[in-house]
């Protein structure tokens, strides 16, 4: 039951996560105009991943695409490629944790199947995270050295009377939601792992059948493993696996295709 | 059709307040900024402040700060402004103007003079 | 606060002339995000309100005759009236739409000669 719901729970959280990584790499401010000490401008300006926008007070907005590609900065280029592998990964990860959700019967897939496929989901999950984190991190970061570069030569004077004033860009809610939602995927990642281990069999290296003596229970391995004996609750615990058969134990505690978890 | 209409000239003492309005009609009041401007005898246009009738926020030209109060009846879509500790130097012609693309203003009201004499 | 300078401050000009009223401003009114000129220009009248001619420093307003233009960039801007008309004997001003506080320039007053 709570390895059921950690993954349901990583599902969910990862599902919320890449979501954010999606809104995130669309929305536009990723840097916004340093408003200083004024909170009210005439013109304010903010950028995204893909185009820049100029928003008048007069409520006038208007969009530029970047249409070229060689002639932007590599390190956009790197952080739109982080998104975008962000993207992708998670993407493939929420399809493959979709079939590994042990509450979803598909045919007759094995537990362990289920296992390698929670755990394939978790690590794209957390790949995932981290390719948003580094992403956004990368874009704060040439902010911050942007913005103390034009804080440096913020006003160039020009034959002494004439000032241009730089325009300065500060963190936009796109990097906050970048931040949070990569945190989510990542946390999701780490559910699913967790997860994983719980679905996983102990011993998977063999298959067995449980064999029953007319006098005591022994539960016979073939292939010169030892033996356990069914006494107490140890073949309780110990999941023996061969296709459809089961142990007797198991035919009464695990749920039948049919049932919903 | 667009128009902006302003309430009539007034005189007034110095230290005396006055309060200008300006009728908006033709268009949808709350989408757009309405800003004040005055112009004395002479002198060179001077903005004054400006107000959203949608989420009526404000702001003014520090030169006016604490003298002028911009406020709005949405209901009338009506706008006005509001002078006060008058001194002769504020004897002018005031404006109120819509906001368009580009930051410009493209509708004026008619004007209204205040005579701020003893 | 930008200030802005219009030369001259007064022109006399011949019908059917051009006329050239310029705008210096104290800042650049060039906003790098869109590479617009918050530049305005208005035209008035005695008696008048003013009455919006350009935007964006050379975008006309829909009305305003083609004989109306405008240019520049930066700190330097210019009205030009192609072919001067009766109708256009005016104060002519620049504002900058660029900045709080809007600021205007001190006018320029059209005439026939």
């Known amino acids: 039951m709570a390895v059921t719901a950690c993954q349901g729970l990583g599902f969910v959280v990862s599902l919320i996560g890449i979501a954010g990584i999606i809104a995130a790499t669309c929305m536009d401010q990723w840097s916004t105009q340093d408003l200083y000490n004024n909170p009210v401008t005439a013109v304010f300006n903010y950028q995204g991943l893909w185009r820049s926008c100029v928003r008048e007070s007069s409520g006038f907005t208007e969009c530029r695409g970047y249409f070229t590609l060689l002639g932007l900065p590599a390190m956009l280029q790197a952080v739109r490629a982080l998104m975008i592998v962000g993207i992708v990964l998670g993407a493939i990860g929420l399809l493959v944790s979709i079939f590994a959700l042990k509450c979803i019967r598909i045919g007759s897939m094995e537990d362990s199947a289920k296992a390698n496929m929670t755990l394939t989901s978790g690590i794209m999950f957390i790949v995932s995270g981290l390719c948003a984190i580094a992403g956004v991190s990368v874009f704060a970061n040439m902010l911050v050295t942007n913005f103390w570069m034009s804080t440096a030569n913020m006003y160039t004077g020009m034959g002494g009377m004439v000032q241009t004033v730089q325009t300065r860009y500060t963190f936009g809610a796109a990097l906050f939601v970048g931040w949070v939602a990569g945190g989510l995927t990542l946390i999701g990642g780490v559910m699913m792992c967790i997860a994983c281990r719980g679905l996983a069999p102990e011993e998977t290296n063999y298959k067995a059948v449980s064999y029953h003596a007319s006098g005591h229970s022994v539960a016979y391995k073939p292939g010169g493993f030892k033996a356990s004996t069914g006494f107490g609750s140890n073949t309780k615990n110990k999941k023996i696996y061969d296709g459809g058969a089961r142990t007797e134990d198991e035919v009464q505690s695990y749920p039948s295709k049919h049932d919903y978890v | 059709e667009v128009q902006l209409v302003q309430s009539g000239a007034e005189v007034k003492k110095p230290g005396a307040s006055v309060k200008v309005s300006c009728k908006a009609s033709?268009?949808?009041?709350?989408?757009?900024?309405m800003h004040w401007v005055r112009q004395a005898p002479g002198q060179r246009l001077e903005w004054m402040g400006m107000?959203?009738?949608?989420?009526?926020?404000?702001n003014y030209n520090e030169k006016f700060k604490g003298r002028v109060t911009l406020t709005l009846d949405k209901s009338a879509s009506t706008a006005y402004m509001e002078l006060s500790s008058l001194r002769s130097e504020d004897t002018a012609v005031y404006y109120c103007?819509?906001?368009?693309?580009?930051?410009?203003?493209?509708?004026w009201g008619q004007g209204t003079t205040v005579t701020v004499s003893s | 606060d930008i200030v802005l300078t219009q030369s001259p401050d007064s022109l006399a000009v011949s019908l059917g002339e051009r006329a050239t009223i310029n705008c210096k401003s104290s800042?650049?009114?060039?906003?790098?995000?869109?590479?617009?000129?918050?530049l305005t220009w208005y035209q008035q009248k005695p008696g008048q309100p003013p009455k919006l001619l350009i935007y964006?420093?050379?975008t006309r307003e829909s009305g305003v005759p083609d004989r109306f233009s405008g240019s520049g960039s930066g700190t330097d801007f210019t009205l030009t009236i192609s072919s001067l008309q009766a109708e256009d004997v005016a104060v002519y001003y620049c504002?900058?739409?660029?900045?709080?506080?809007?600021?205007f320039g001190q006018g320029t007053k059209l005439e026939i000669k």
């Open positions: 103007a819509r906001l368009k693309t580009g930051n410009s203003f493209d509708y």
């Open positions: 033709g268009y949808t009041f709350t989408s757009y900024w």
């Open positions: 107000i959203h009738p949608n989420s009526g926020s404000t």
């Open positions: 800042q650049s009114l060039l906003n790098s995000g869109n590479q617009k000129n918050y």
């Open positions: 964006w420093a050379s």
């Open positions: 504002q900058n739409a660029y900045t709080y506080p809007f600021t």
